[in-house]
Structures are given as structure tokens and as C-alpha cells.
């Protein structure tokens, strides 16, 4: 999916108002220094591509984060503010959600959510630069 035509201001507002709080809640009990940020992004569409991938694509040690509250809110935000996102992405992410086995917050999942926080912060920084 090409995130170029998204309403970035609206996405930023949703992130700051609600998604960020759920990410931080998920990470509660860990320190920001516990994980190194290895994933980066260069512009707003690229940041959203990476956020989408890390949130909804299962990885070997973190089956899927798609059922978490921050993921549901991310999906809702992208559906609202990115034209055509629902039509091209929702069925794919629903299938990934079904693949999830058990709800265990592993260290690998914490690391993945830490990367997500970094990507979102980067998204907002690139937004500020453009204004």
C-alpha cells in the first residue's frame, strides 16, 4: 500500500491522543534503554510502511501484535485517513490476526513495540520538519 496520500496531520493527532498511550502501557515495566532502535524511516509514507509492517506482520519470535489495543487503533486510524487502505489491507491483516496462537508478551514482542515507538516518534519528527 502506498501511504503517500494519507492525511498525516490527522494520523499524528490520533497517535498523540490515544495510540501512544497504548504503546506505552504495553511497554510498562521496561526502560527505554532496554532495547536499541534498529528500524528507521526517512519520510512520512516510509514511516507508515514500516509501522504497518511491524504492527501487523508476524515475526518468528513475536507471532502477531495485531490483537493488541494499539494495533486495533492503528488499523482504525489508517482506515480513516488513508484513502483505499481498508480495501487493500484489512483482509490481509485480519488473516494475520487469525494466525496468532497465544497472548504472551515475550521479550521479542517488547522489543518490537519499542521499535514501533521509535518509528512513530520519527513519523512525528518528519511531520514537524515539513511544517
Amino acid at each position: 500500500y502506498d501511504f503517500t496520500n494519507c492525511d498525516f496531520q490527522k494520523i499524528e493527532a490520533d497517535y498523540l491522543r490515544t495510540i501512544s498511550k497504548d504503546l506505552i502501557t504495553y511497554m510498562s515495566g521496561t526502560k527505554s534503554t532496554d532495547f536499541n532502535n534498529t528500524v528507521s524511516c526517512s519520510n512520512r509514507p516510509h514511516c507508515l510502511t514500516e509501522i504497518q509492517s511491524l504492527t501487523f506482520n508476524p515475526t518468528p519470535r513475536c507471532a502477531s501484535l495485531a490483537k493488541e489495543m494499539f494495533a486495533r487503533k492503528t488499523k482504525a486510524t489508517l482506515a480513516l485517513w488513508c484513502p483505499g487502505y481498508s480495501e487493500t489491507q484489512i483482509n490481509a491483516t485480519q488473516a494475520m490476526k487469525k494466525a496468532r496462537k497465544s497472548k504472551v508478551t515475550t521479550n521479542k514482542c517488547l522489543e518490537q513495540v519499542s521499535q514501533l515507538l521509535g518509528l512513530w516518534r520519527r513519523f512525528i519528527r518528519t511531520l514537524l520538519k515539513k511544517q
Epitope: D14, R72, A76, T77, G84
Partner: antibody
Framework: QVQLVQSGAEVKKPGSSVKVSCKAS????????INWVRQAPGQGLEWLGV????????IYAEKFQGRVTITADTSTSTAYMELSSLRSEDTAVYYC?????????????WGQGTLVTVSS | QSALTQPPSASGSPGQSVTISCTGT?????????VSWYQQHPGKAPKLMIY???KRPSGVPDRFSGSKSGNTASLTVSGLQAEDEADYYC???????????FGGGTKLTVL
Amino acid sequence: QVQLVQSGAEVKKPGSSVKVSCKASGFTFGSYGINWVRQAPGQGLEWLGVIVPLVGVTIYAEKFQGRVTITADTSTSTAYMELSSLRSEDTAVYYCARGQEYFYWYFDLWGQGTLVTVSS
Amino acid sequence: QSALTQPPSASGSPGQSVTISCTGTSSDIGGYDRVSWYQQHPGKAPKLMIYGVSKRPSGVPDRFSGSKSGNTASLTVSGLQAEDEADYYCSSYASGHTFGLFGGGTKLTVL
């Protein structure tokens, strides 16, 4: 069962406000959009706005911006639509309608409608 | 945005097919595959018949079908039955985050 139940008919004076409620049951209220649509007597359908409780987003039709307020109480699975500065042209049946999860612009479940009459 | 354009009336005999058109612009119908159709019987709430241009919700007979070409969407009702007599409204998502840009409605009469 899966349904939207709206509050009863209202008669209002021009210049006043009206608040219509819409109680959801049988589905996860927060995940869907709750849209508001009105229909004046003998006329077509007109979209007023939507709320998506999951992310706390409200979007209003340009025509009603500043005059309509849509809110939701997730603890009671109830959405509200308040329309202010009423005029006779606002006389209509007001419907709440569920927007599909992540496809909030398809209205797959409707309330029974609330008749709002604006008359002096 | 101005409302989508529908013919005020359409008619057909039982068993026949009838097509209702809905014309918009590149900012609504032409720009998104987010067209839906609603059936409304007198004194009742509307009912979703078609969404996503051509998808049918469960419970809607396959006699109802939808399509789109450019800025115009169409609803076809084949094998007309008496209970199909109702008002039909098209709706489209429109730029500027308008979730329900409706047509003026078409009164379908089964002769």
C-alpha cells in the same frame, strides 16, 4: 440481538437544541463507526457525521460543522447527536447507523429513527 | 459537495430487470470503490443492499447486483418481485472525509 435503539420523538422551538441518543447492543460498540443520517419529510437521506469510539474520532459534514456535536459513552454503548440553533428545515427523522468495522462508510445496521419536529 | 444524481423513478414488471443509475464525480464515485446502495420501504429505516460497489451483505438476494464505470454507479434488480417496490438510495464516500454522500433517491415501482 444486534440492534440500535434510539430515543423518542421530540418537539422543539426554533433556536433551541435537541439531543438524540442511540443505544447499541449485541456487538462491540467501540470498534464500529456510529453515523448519523437524517431524512426530512418526503425527502432523501443526508449524512450529518460519524464517531469512531475506538480512536475518539468525530467527522462532521461541512454543512453541519459548528451546529452538530456527536459524542459516545463506551461504558453504556450509547452514541449521542446534538443539533443546535434549530430551524424549521431541521424537521426530519434522524437515524443512527452503524458503519462497518474499518469500513465506517457502509451503514449495515440502522436505528428505528427519531422524529424531530421544529415548530414555534 | 452536491448530492449524487439518480433518476426520480424507475419501473418494471414482475420477473423483469431494472437498472438504477447514480452519477457523481471523480471526487466521489470515480475516486473511490466505496459505493453503497440502500433500500427503504415507506415508514421504515433504510437497509444496506450493496457495499464496496458490488458486494452483497448476507441475507440480500443475489437478484441485486452493483457495478461502477467511471463516475457512474448502477444497481440492477433482476427477476423483479412485488416486495422490491421501494425507494433506493446510492451513497459514496467523498473526498474531504465525507462518509455518506447520498443520491436523491429513486422510487422503484413494480407494475
